[in-house]
C-alpha cells in the first residue's frame, strides 16, 4: 500500500478534474498560437465588413499523460475558475483545446445588403483566451 | 450533443461515475461520496466540426474553414471536448479543516462537441 499522503487540501485537489489554464502542468507543449486572419480568406467579407482582419488564436500541442504515481496534491486556494472538466478518465484522451466557457466574442460591423446598411454584431466564442489539455 | 451508446465512435458524452472513495479523496470531500462527472470521447471528423450543436463555437467554424481550404494552421487537431458543464454542490474540508459547503463550477459534463 502507498504511504499516506500529506494532507491534500480540499478543493484545489480538484485540479485532477479541473486544472486551471495557467498551469502548463505536465502538458508544457499545449499552447496558444496566434494567426492573423482576414475575413476575405474565410469567405466572410461580404458579411463582415469591419474589421478586415483580426488576431485569431488557436490551441496547439500534445497532451501526453504523465501523472506521477504519488501525485503531490496542491496548495491551498479557491477551487479553480475557470475550471476544467473531468477528463482523466477511462478512454478519455486529453486534448489540447480552448477551455470551454472562456472564449471571448469579437465585435464586428456587418452588412446583409451589399453595404447599403450596416449592423454592429457580436460573433460569439471566437477568441481563445486559454488553452488546456481537456 | 450525442450520448455514447456503444454504436457510434463519433464525439459523444460517456456517462461515468466518479467514486471519491476509489481515488482516495473521501478524506477531504465529505459529500457526496461520488457523482456522475461523465466525460467526452470519440472522433471529430472535419464534417462534424461544422455541424451546429457538434461544433463547440464560431472558433471551430473558423478553424474548419481553414481545414476545408487546405490551409493548415499548425495542424490543429479537432478535439471532442465538453461544451456544456454544470455545477455540483459539495461539502468538503478546507485547508484548516473547517467545513465548507460550496457549489463547485464545471464539475459535470453535460454535453460534448468538437473543437
Amino acid at each position: 500500500s502507498t504511504p499516506p499522503m500529506s494532507w491534500p487540501w480540499s478543493p484545489s485537489a480538484l485540479r485532477l478534474l479541473q486544472r486551471p489554464p495557467e498551469e502548463p502542468a505536465a502538458h508544457a507543449n499545449c499552447h496558444r498560437v496566434a494567426l492573423n486572419i482576414s475575413f476575405q480568406e474565410l469567405g466572410w467579407e461580404r458579411w463582415i465588413v469591419y474589421p478586415p482582419s483580426f488576431i485569431f488564436h488557436y490551441c496547439h500541442g500534445g497532451c501526453g499523460l504523465h501523472i506521477p504515481p504519488n501525485l503531490p496534491l496542491p496548495v491551498p486556494g479557491a477551487p479553480p475558475t475557470p475550471a476544467q472538466p473531468p477528463s482523466l478518465l477511462p478512454g478519455a484522451q486529453p486534448c489540447c483545446a480552448a477551455l470551454p466557457g472562456t472564449m471571448r466574442p469579437l465585435h464586428v460591423r456587418t452588412t446583409s445588403d451589399g453595404g447599403y446598411s450596416f449592423k454592429y454584431e457580436t460573433v460569439p466564442n471566437l477568441l481563445t483566451q486559454h488553452c488546456a489539455c481537456i | 450533443g450525442l450520448e455514447c451508446d456503444g454504436r457510434t465512435n463519433l464525439c459523444c458524452r460517456q456517462q461515468f461515475f466518479i467514486d471519491f472513495r476509489l481515488i482516495g479523496w473521501n478524506d477531504w470531500i465529505i459529500a457526496p461520496t461520488g457523482y456522475y462527472g461523465n466525460y467526452c470521447e470519440g472522433s471529430c471528423p472535419a464534417y462534424l466540426a461544422g455541424v451546429p450543436g457538434s461544433a463547440s463555437s464560431f472558433h471551430t467554424a473558423v478553424v474548419n474553414q481553414y481545414r476545408m481550404r487546405g490551409l493548415n494552421p499548425g495542424a490543429v487537431n479537432s478535439c471532442c471536448i465538453p461544451t456544456k458543464l454544470s455545477t455540483m454542490s459539495m461539502l468538503y474540508f478546507d485547508d484548516e479543516y473547517n467545513i465548507v459547503k460550496r457549489d463547485v463550477p464545471n464539475m459535470i459534463v453535460e454535453e460534448c462537441g468538437c473543437a
Partner: antibody
Framework: QVQLQQPGAELVKPGASVKLSCKAS????????MYWVKQRPGQGLEWIGM????????NYNGKFKTGATLTVDKSSSTVYMQLSSLTSEDSAVYYC???????????????WGQGTSVTVSS | QIVLTQSPAIMSASLGERVTMTCTAS???????FHWYQQKPGSSPKLWIY???NLASGVPARFSGSGSGTSYSLTISTMEAEDAVTYYC?????????FGGGTKLEIK
C-alpha cells in the same frame, strides 16, 4: 452492526506513554473518519483529533498536537492514539467515535466506543 | 476556536414539566453543523439531535432542538425520569470541533 471496541482501562506512570486502541467492525472501515474525545472525571467532552483510515490523514486540536499521535492499521481495522509524557492532567476516559453520514449532508459522531479509562499515577 | 457555553450547568425539573436548555456559541455556527449528545453516567455519549433539529434514531418525540447563528436550544416537552442525564452541545463547523461544558438535568 457497527462496533468500536476499546480496552477498559490503562494504568501508567507519570512521564510514560500509552497507546490506546479502537477496533472497528460492522462497516467499511476506510470510508469513515475516526475521532478521539477526552473526558476528565466529572468534566465535559474535549475533541482531541481525527484520522481517516483510507489515507492516514490526521487533524488535531492544537491543544493535543504535541501530546497525542493518531495512527491506523488498515489490516486489523484498528486506529490507535499514543499519548506521551503523561501527567495527572491526562487521567481521563478516552473515547473513539466514528464520524458518520446521516443523509442530506448531515454528519455526526454516530457510534462511540465504550471508552478507555487512563489513570496516570506513580 | 468557537467556545460553546451551556446554561444552566445544572438544572432541576419536575416530571411532566417542559424543560429548555441553551447553548451559546462565541461566533456564528451553521445550523447544519450543530448537534446535541446525551450522556448517562458511566456510559459513552450518544448522538441525540443532529443538525440543530433532527432527532437521532430512537430519540423520543418529546425532544426537540432549534436555533441558528450563535443561539441554540434543546427542549423536552414533558420531562420523564430517564431524561435526567447530561446533555452536551457540539459544533463541527470550525476546527477545532468543540463541545459545550454540558447541562446536567436532575429531577426536582
Amino acid at each position: 452492526q457497527v462496533q468500536l471496541q476499546q480496552p477498559g482501562a490503562e494504568l501508567v506512570k507519570p512521564g510514560a506513554s500509552v497507546k490506546l486502541s479502537c477496533k472497528a467492525s460492522g462497516y467499511t472501515f476506510t470510508n469513515y473518519w475516526m475521532y478521539w474525545v477526552k473526558q476528565r472525571p466529572g468534566q465535559g467532552l474535549e475533541w482531541i483529533g481525527m484520522i481517516h483510515p483510507n489515507s492516514g490523514s490526521t487533524n488535531y486540536n492544537g491543544k493535543f498536537k504535541t501530546g497525542a499521535t493518531l495512527t491506523v492499521d488498515k489490516s486489523s481495522s484498528t486506529v490507535y492514539m499514543q499519548l506521551s509524557s503523561l501527567t495527572s492532567e491526562d487521567s481521563a476516559v478516552y473515547y473513539c467515535a466514528r464520524w458518520g453520514y446521516g443523509g442530506n449532508y448531515d454528519y455526526a459522531m454516530d457510534y462511540w466506543g465504550q471508552g478507555t479509562s487512563v489513570t496516570v499515577s506513580s | 476556536q468557537i467556545v460553546l457555553t451551556q446554561s444552566p450547568a445544572i438544572m432541576s425539573a419536575s416530571l411532566g414539566e417542559r424543560v429548555t436548555m441553551t447553548c451559546t456559541a462565541s461566533s456564528s455556527v451553521s445550523s447544519s453543523y450543530f448537534h446535541w449528545y446525551q450522556q448517562k453516567p458511566g456510559s459513552s455519549p450518544k448522538l441525540w439531535i443532529y443538525s440543530t433539529s433532527n432527532l437521532a434514531s430512537g430519540v423520543p418525540a418529546r425532544f426537540s432542538g432549534s436555533g441558528s447563528g450563535t443561539s441554540y436550544s434543546l427542549t423536552i416537552s414533558t420531562m420523564e425520569a430517564e431524561d435526567a442525564v447530561t446533555y452536551y452541545c457540539h459544533q463541527y463547523h470550525r476546527s477545532p470541533w468543540t463541545f459545550g461544558g454540558g447541562t446536567k438535568l436532575e429531577i426536582k
